[in-house]
């Protein structure tokens, strides 16, 4: 029997075991998180696997994933919301360490899908393990893009008090309109809300001694925030290594000076 | 064999105190989560509190009509959960379940205690 | 406070099978596990099905429990004349950060 003709994208197919990967990572999140005992994981997946299985793959909308979000709901203490721009890992890192402020990887629906890629096919119930579409050579609105637009936009959305974003110094563009960051979260930071937005600028060069926010686009981000009627403020983190040191030490006597 | 027995149920008057215990045997008290739950004459049951395990923050969480009058607490070193009740009224007037959790469900439950609030 | 909805009574002649449903929104049985207690009068409740369909060991295989978006069942098959008794839905209900429980329903065995 030949194989049913499959739609071929651009980008790279589903992760093996990815619905085993997404139940899975449920069951360990609300192992650890006691608010969250009561979930029941099977929903969980069932609602995920709605949003994109059987939909064509580059029409997928937030309005798929709402079944998702609505059981995904979980609350951020105000002043404890990380926001990050291309420097995941270090905002991990720290997170990991300041076990009081969460990042949306920290967070059930952003835990879950953290690393994944997944695509369904028009009017099958298969999951696409071959393929599934790029976000730039075939279209923006598929399963994974999607997802991170909504559930970011849901983040900031329920941000409160001061809130945090780690910027990449390092890049050409400190702050990048086009990035999640840029395109989703600034522009959905509630003013009734939100007293604050404070970024980290955090340098990639031991000897960087620069005042990173200065930079242009960082002027850029203040002026779109303050627009927003939201305060903003501006600190580098000229060596990220000390920084996290003393995040976890903080009574260490080097962590006293600048870092 | 996991056992739970309340006591400290009785007759008090409107706006009166009860302190309500459930002694727990036959499994780790420490790490199980502990609630207390209540059936009025007649009817169905009713959440009243419920308590986690210290070791997941030992917070207390308690139903909106018994907000502000009750306070669900426990001692470890004595593997007793309690009912601390004040301005009891009428409407309080149940048979009160203290029930242990298996992870995030409640698995066992004690016979019951009999609280009547009356002049 | 508000209950997860329940048909307040139920019957059926033995060796019937009967289907009591639970019915929640999404902060409850939608996002949460349900599970099911069955009460004889004047006796604690006892756990019959936890997590939408698992039996505790000593529990009959003629009951069974299923969930699907904010609504569960529980089904008992093969009805048998000691199957009388109240039967309680629950589910931790998010918004409240507290169980709810359903109105219970009394079983009949004809």
């Known amino acids: 029997v030949l194989p049913r003709w499959r739609q071929q994208w651009s980008g790279s197919g589903t992760t093996s075991r990815f619905p085993e990967t997404v139940l899975a990572r449920c069951v360990k999140y609300t192992e650890v998180h006691p608010e969250m005992r009561h979930v029941d994981c099977q929903s969980v997946w069932d609602a995920f696997k709605g949003a994109f299985i059987s939909k064509y793959p580059c029409n997928i909308t937030e309005e798929d994933y709402q079944p998702l979000v609505k059981l995904g709901t979980q609350t951020v203490p105000c002043n404890k919301t990380l926001l990050w721009s291309r420097i995941k890992d270090l905002a991990h890192q720290f997170t990991q360490v300041q076990r009081d402020m969460f990042t949306l990887e920290d967070m059930l629906l952003g835990y879950l899908a953290d690393d994944l890629t997944w695509c369904g096919e028009f009017n099958t119930f298969e999951i696409n393990y071959q393929s599934c579409p790029d976000w730039r050579k075939d279209c923006s609105n598929n399963p994974v893009s999607v997802f991170w637009k909504t559930v970011s936009r849901r983040f900031a959305e329920t941000a409160c008090g001061v809130v945090h974003v780690m910027l990449n110094g390092s890049r050409s563009k400190i702050f990048d309109k086009n990035s999640t960051f840029g395109s989703v979260e600034v522009h959905n930071l509630q003013p009734e809300k939100v007293q604050a937005l404070e970024a980290w600028v955090i340098h990639g060069g031991r000897e960087d001694s620069r005042d990173l926010c200065q930079d242009p686009t960082i002027k850029e981000l203040e002026s779109i925030i303050s627009k927003r009627n939201i305060r903003f403020f501006c600190k580098n983190i000229y060596r990220p290594d000390k920084f996290l040191q003393c995040v976890k030490n903080p009574e260490d006597s080097s962590c006293l000076s600048g870092i | 064999e996991v056992q739970l027995l309340e006591s400290g149920g009785g007759l008090v008057p409107p706006g009166g105190s009860l302190r309500l215990s459930c002694a727990a045997s036959g499994f780790t008290f420490t790490n199980a989560w502990m609630s207390w739950v209540r059936q009025a004459p007649g009817k169905g049951l009713e959440w009243v509190s419920t308590?986690?395990?210290?070791?997941?923050?030992?917070?207390?969480y308690s139903a909106d009509s018994v907000k502000g009058r009750f306070t669900i607490s426990r001692d470890d070193s004595k593997n007793t959960l309690y009912l601390q009740m004040n301005s009891l009224r009428a409407e309080d007037t149940a048979v009160y379940y203290c029930a242990k959790y298996d992870y995030n469900y409640m698995d066992v439950w004690g016979q019951g205690t009999t609280v009547t609030v009356s002049s | 406070q508000s209950v997860l909805t329940q048909p307040p009574s139920a019957s059926g002649t033995p060796g019937q099978r009967v289907t009591i449903s639970c019915s929640g929104t999404?902060?409850?049985?939608?996002?949460?596990?349900v599970h099911w207690y069955q009460q004889f009068p004047g006796t604690a409740p006892k756990l019959l099905i936890y997590r939408n369909s698992q039996r505790p060991s000593g529990v009959p295989d003629r009951f069974s429990g299923s969930k699907s978006g904010t609504s569960a069942s529980l089904a008992i098959s093969g009805l048998q004349s000691e199957d009388e008794a109240d039967y309680y839905c629950a589910a931790w209900d998010d918004s409240l950060n507290g169980w709810l429980f359903g109105g219970g329903t009394k079983l009949t065995v004809l």
């Open positions: 308590i986690r395990s210290k070791t997941d923050g030992g917070t207390p």
């Open positions: 999404t902060s409850n049985i939608g996002r949460n596990y």
